[in-house]
């Protein structure tokens, strides 16, 4: 008789989760020679230890500390790109502009990107059926706490000019409830960070509005200014051209506004 299992509102753990995490770790240590000291089995053991046998609504940042320690990584603090609701373009950008880094370009972000995971209290099983939804079930679930933890650490590490890519097609270009708005903004260190520069990405071909004047951007500016960090904003009217010009900056069409 199958034992009763808690039914959560969110999707279950990504299939082949352990194998995926291990394979991603192996690949990452191949691609990044500076991370070849990392033991991928230890990383998986620490990842597993953060949520296995624990109630999936009672996860803490402390649970992830062993994993954070193993995944400690130095990225150039002045080359950090944050993003909100526009992950794909941010990742396309750092794939071209190799000296800049999103969270998902770090080992821990790379391991967990697009994955879901949770366990069950008092059993060593991974729950592949369902996991807690942040809104409908609980916020202290394994996935949310992981991203809160790594996002906080990433923002704390930033210095000089920090860039953030924001989605100009959304009703709230800056959303206080996003990871960027609720975690990263509040963990930038004013003694290290001089400026936060927002890049507002336009969606429509003919959209020539200055989205830097959007009320939510003004709200972001206010929050940042109160934290003694300067704020600047740029419209990226043509994201496709923007990427093309990052690839080929000497192209003659790249001198005009993008």
């Amino acid at each position: 008789v199958p034992r009763w299992r808690q039914q959560w509102s969110g999707p279950g753990t990504t299939k082949r989760f352990p194998e995926t995490v291990l394979a991603r770790c192996v690949k990452y240590t191949e691609i990044h020679p500076e991370m070849r000291h990392v033991d991928c089995q230890s990383v998986w053991d620490a990842f597993k230890g953060a949520f296995i046998s624990k109630h999936p609504c009672n996860i803490t940042e402390e649970d992830y500390q062993p994993l954070m320690k193993l995944g400690t990584q130095t990225v150039p603090c002045n080359k950090i790109l944050l993003w909100s609701r526009i992950k794909d373009l941010a990742h396309q950008f750092t794939q071209v502009q190799r000296d800049m880094f999103t969270l998902e370009d770090t080992l821990l972000g790379y391991l967990a990107d697009d994955l879901t995971w949770c366990g069950e209290f008092n059993t060593s099983k991974i729950n592949y059926q369902s996991c807690p939804d942040w809104r409908k079930d609980c916020s202290n679930n394994p996935v949310s706490v992981f991203w809160k933890t790594v996002s906080r650490r990433f923002a704390e590490a930033a210095c000089d000019v920090v860039h953030v890519m924001l989605n100009g097609s959304r009703s709230k270009i800056f959303d206080k409830n996003s990871t960027f708005g609720s975690v990263e903004v509040h963990n930038l260190q004013p003694e290290k960070v001089q400026t936060l520069e927002a890049w507002v990405i336009h969606g429509g071909r003919e959209d020539s509005r200055d989205l830097c004047q959007d009320p939510t951007i003004k709200e972001l500016e206010s929050i940042i200014s109160k934290r003694n960090i300067q704020f600047s904003c740029k419209n990226i009217y043509r994201p496709d051209k923007f990427l093309q010009c990052v690839k080929n900056p000497e192209d003659s069409s790249c001198t005009s506004e993008i």
Epitope: L22, V26, K27, E30, R36, H37
Partner: antibody, heavy 120, light 112 residues
Framework: QVQLLQSGAELVRPGVSVKISCTGS????????VHWVKQSHVKSLEWIGV????????TYNQKFTGKATMTVDKSSSTAYMELARLTSEDSAIYFC?????????????WGQGTSVTVSS | DVVMIQTPLSLPVSLGDQASISCRPS???????????LNWYLQRPGQSPKLLIY???KRFSGVPDRFSGSGSGTDFTLKISRVEAEDLGVYLC?????????FGSGTQLEIK
Amino acid sequence: QVQLLQSGAELVRPGVSVKISCTGSGYSFTNYAVHWVKQSHVKSLEWIGVISPYYGDTTYNQKFTGKATMTVDKSSSTAYMELARLTSEDSAIYFCARRFEGFYYSMDYWGQGTSVTVSS
Amino acid sequence: DVVMIQTPLSLPVSLGDQASISCRPSQSLVHSNGNTYLNWYLQRPGQSPKLLIYKVSKRFSGVPDRFSGSGSGTDFTLKISRVEAEDLGVYLCSQSTHVPLTFGSGTQLEIK
């Protein structure tokens, strides 16, 4: 299943070079470094070096710098090792081995070995 | 380079007996990441080495539980609880903590 298939035995004259190959299958070749190891009666097993197929970057045992050159061809999932200016001391069995999942500098699966005999 | 001293050179055993092989590296094998990369391989005649034990005591997939590894610092041991015919061959210890990686000279396990 993971397999590393090496090229056949070589009988070569002193002073020339030889290039041996190691083709990986049953796993994502690009994501796993390939180690090379020499086995001779004199010195048992000696680590020559390791190459990462992703970018082709290498780490050599100093002892084999100038003697061995490791390369990869990602399109054919094949790693190569060229041995230069051969002498009788280079007569040995050469193994390729895949990096262990857990750690870059450990090895799990090995090829069957390629015998190199240097003789005039 | 780390020198791996393996003893004995040859180990005659009867089938069903316990066998014990020692490996002593010339320096600590504790890596900066906290792990100890001491591995054991079995090389049967005419074959390539097969991984048995990694990180001192972890059995590689498919390795029978009659094989066990132990030790710390600069003193490591491989034990075979009940020797079977298929266990015969040369046992090699290796370290992958320090570059260059190095191997012991091998222990020949043979029938008494």
